[in-house]
């Protein structure tokens, strides 16, 4: 039985050209996290494997940085980065947990800076 829950930063916004941290947290389970995948719609951004460490997909190497923790830092944001992001936790013995974050990249300084994981 899967008892865990994923907490995410939810809906967040950031300015074009800036950076943002996508963060998920798995709680309420003793399952071992073996791998976390970060995906944007159907594109794999990065993998954090418990044994192999981080692997950033080649097409995102220039703009994606691993961490902090199991989170992911997106840099040099463009309006095209607006959309859904998913953290997919592969765990043993529970299975897979998925969290969703919606990022809106805004053209001007109307972006909200209240998200607690955002980089100033």
């Amino acid at each position: 039985m899967m008892t865990g829950t994923i907490e995410t930063t939810g809906n967040i916004s950031a300015e074009k050209g800036g950076s943002i941290i996508l963060q998920c947290h798995l709680s309420s389970t003793t399952a071992q996290v073996t791998q976390v995948n970060w995906e944007q719609q159907d594109q794999l951004l990065a993998i954090c494997n418990a044994d192999l460490g981080w692997h950033i997909s080649p097409s995102f190497k220039d703009r994606v940085a691993p961490g902090p923790g199991l989170g992911l830092t997106l840099q040099s944001l463009t309006v095209n980065d607006t959309g859904e992001y998913f953290c997919i936790y592969h765990t043993y013995p529970d299975g897979t947990y998925t969290g969703r974050i919606f990022l809106e990249v805004l053209e001007s300084s109307v972006a909200e800076h209240g998200a607690r994981f955002q980089i100033p």
């Epitope: 044994d51 192999l52 460490g53 981080w54 691993p66 961490g67």
Partner: antibody, heavy 117, light 107 residues
């Protein structure tokens, strides 16, 4: 006792192919990712490729991407490295190693690959 | 890619000396650094992992420290069997990278 035994090295001409094997024993093979690391004569260590325990994901250094293929047969407790389009700069001792939590805890004795005409 | 800069590239020391080897890496900010010992004609052997954890069977005269971008391997009292080449390695992100090695020679 964990043991890793590489084989398949030898002399090959530039552009040629070679398949290295690494026979593993003394541990539950499919529970561990595995990796290949090479060392050119008189030089330092260079990571080549890694594979997850299931074999479902593989990773490569840019220097070998598209030419080398890592694979494993968990029923035979064996790791492989298929090397194609070999170049002089691929000349090295190739080591297989077991991966555990971001480090390489057991290494084989190595097998020498020489690429020369 | 994360570059691991190891220093010194070589050093001469006597039995009983305290030896320190350092490794620094850009963009690290973690403790996923390991140290290996290699003797001529032999495979590398794991000494330290996660920056400071001693691998099984490794003598307690070896120790590791550091976090973030700078890591250190210390041999508290050099023994004859410790003359070898030592490598650091980062396992935080692929491609894994090694330092260029430090050769510890007899003075």
């Amino acid at each position: 006792e964990v043991q890793l035994l590489e084989s398949g090295g030898g002399l090959v001409q530039p552009g040629g192919s070679l398949r290295l094997s690494c026979a593993a024993s003394g541990f539950t093979f499919n529970a561990y990712p595995m990796t290949w690391v090479r060392q050119a004569p008189g030089k330092g260590l260079e990571w080549v490729s890694a594979i997850t325990g299931s074999g479902g994901s593989t990773y490569y250094a840019d220097s070998v991407k598209g030419r080398f293929t890592i694979s494993r047969d968990n029923s035979k407790n064996t790791l492989y490295l298929q090397m194609n389009s070999l170049r002089a700069e691929d000349t090295a001792v190739y080591y297989c190693a077991r991966v555990w939590r971001n480090h390489l805890d057991y290494w084989g004795q190595g097998t020498l690959v020489t690429v020369s005409s | 890619d994360i570059q691991m800069t190891q220093s010194p590239s070589s050093l001469s020391a006597s039995v009983g000396d305290r030896v320190t080897i350092t490794c620094s890496g850009d963009k690290l900010g973690h403790t996923y650094t390991s140290w290996y010992q290699q003797k001529p004609g032999k495979a590398p052997k794991l000494l330290i992992y996660r920056a400071s954890t001693l691998a099984s069977g490794v003598p307690s005269r070896f120790s590791g420290s550091g976090s973030g971008t700078d890591f250190t391997l210390t041999i508290s009292s050099l023994q004859p069997e410790d003359f070898a080449t030592y490598y650091c390695q980062q396992g935080y992100t692929l491609p894994w990278t090694f330092g260029q090695g430090t050769k510890v020679e007899i003075k």
